[in-house]
Interface confidence: medium
């Protein structure tokens, strides 16, 4: 009822000494290589001169950091990055970066990359509201600090701040129009 | 060991400003960006907006009108300034520090503020 | 924005059920992460982008889930699992938006 050698899973170590009888019940707990990580369970158990178990070492590194336009990679680049290494990027001048930093590699897979914007904080065109439009012709480009102002059709009352402006590229929150309660 | 930590006023006069500081530790907000995050029982929670490591900073379109987000890397503080408060921005004030993905791994322990006269 | 459904808002569970709570957007989205939330406390990071468990998180926790439909099982419930989960999205060039929470109580 005894089980003889150890059995061998890809990419998995066994801990602790290795002997060469193991007695029916005793446990042997797996660990995974670098880059690895365990799914499931980690012990294989001996059984009737068996082992049943079957721990599954899953690769969790990245590779190919995402590439950021108008952006460079500050950190040591390498070949394969372990799950939890963080990789910098930096903007070319004179882009200016929105979002995190630093991207990290997340069992397998990269966090959402920054964007590198042009700095001039510049708007698209403003937001639609419903039963209601801008008092001016609406352009593809607003200089940020600049301001537009809504209106309601017939029948509809503005609520909110009629006015918004463009701010680090952002409108402010439009108003809305709402139909007047009818007594 | 990572901590955010808040203080700012508990009670705000309607149409006055708030003002919170969130001082970090255990982390340098050179490498990490800060969200800022309110929890009311009437509109849950809410994102407010985000300083990033950089210095930059994204808004939620709902506040950017009369929210503002700075730090001071060098004392590890952010700050976070609201204007013209009303009783519906009576809320727990949160800040808390970017995992990646715009998820947000460690949270300060919140600054509950009422606006009434 | 993206509106987050959680349901159900209430749930109630026995110690060793498994029990599944869903988070539905009303368009798609690029993450989803869960939150846990207990009385008088903070929010912590229960599950990042969609199926990566926090530290700390016990491993009869998973997630799962991908376009408009995400969920978080429990697969034996703990009576510290009592607690209000929230999703959380992230979508491209759309703010952060929270779902109302599915609080999970113990009989």
């Known amino acids: 009822t005894d089980c003889l050698s150890l059995p061998s899973f890809e990419n998995a170590i066994p801990m602790g000494e290795k002997k060469d009888v193991y007695k029916a019940g005793e446990q042997v707990t797996y660990t995974c290589a670098t880059y690895y990580k365990m799914d499931g369970a980690s012990n294989v158990t001996c059984i009737n001169s068996r082992w049943t178990g079957r721990p599954t070492c899953r690769d969790t590194s990245c590779v190919n950091p995402p590439t950021v336009q108008n952006a460079y990679i500050v950190s040591r680049q390498m070949s394969k990055y372990p799950s939890g290494e963080r990789v910098r990027y930096q903007c070319r001048s004179p882009y200016e970066m929105f979002g995190d930093e630093e991207v990290m590699c997340l069992n397998g897979n990269w966090t959402e990359p920054p964007q590198c914007k042009d700095s001039t904080g510049k708007c698209g065109p403003p937001p639609p509201i419903d039963n209601g439009d801008i008092t001016s012709f609406p352009l593809s480009v607003y200089a940020p600090a600049s301001s537009v102002e809504y209106q309601c059709q017939n029948l509809y009352q503005l609520e909110g701040n009629k006015r918004i402006t463009c701010r680090n590229g952002q409108w402010s929150e439009p108003p809305k129009c709402l139909h007047p309660c009818v007594i | 060991q990572v901590q955010l930590r808040q203080s700012g006023p508990g009670l705000v006069q309607p149409s006055q400003s708030l003002s919170i500081t969130c001082t970090v530790s255990g982390f340098s907000l050179t490498n990490y960006g800060v969200y800022w995050v309110r929890q009311s029982p009437g509109k849950g929670l809410e994102w407010l907006g985000v300083i990033w490591s950089g210095g930059t900073t994204d808004y939620s379109a709902a506040f950017i009108s009369r929210l503002s987000i700075s730090k001071d890397n060098s004392k590890s503080q952010v700050f976070f300034k609201m204007n013209s408060l009303q009783a519906d921005d009576t809320a727990i004030y949160y800040c808390?520090?970017?995992?990646?993905?715009?998820?947000?791994?460690?949270w300060g322990q919140g600054t509950s503020v009422t606006v009434s006269s | 924005q993206i509106v987050l459904s959680q349901s159900p808002t209430i749930l109630s569970a026995s110690p060793g059920e498994k029990v599944t709570m869903t988070c539905r957007a009303s368009s798609s989205v690029t993450y989803m992460h869960w939150y846990q939330q207990k009385p008088g406390s903070s929010p912590k990071p229960w599950i990042y982008a969609t199926s990566n468990l926090a530290s700390g998180v016990p491993a009869r926790f998973s997630g799962s889930g991908s376009g408009t439909s995400y969920s978080l099982t429990i697969s034996r419930v703990e009576a510290e699992d009592a607690a209000t989960y929230y999703c959380q999205q992230r979508s491209s060039s759309n703010p952060l938006t929270f779902g109302a929470g599915t609080k999970l109580e113990l009989k």
């Open positions: 808390a520090r970017n995992f990646g993905n715009y998820a947000m791994d460690y």
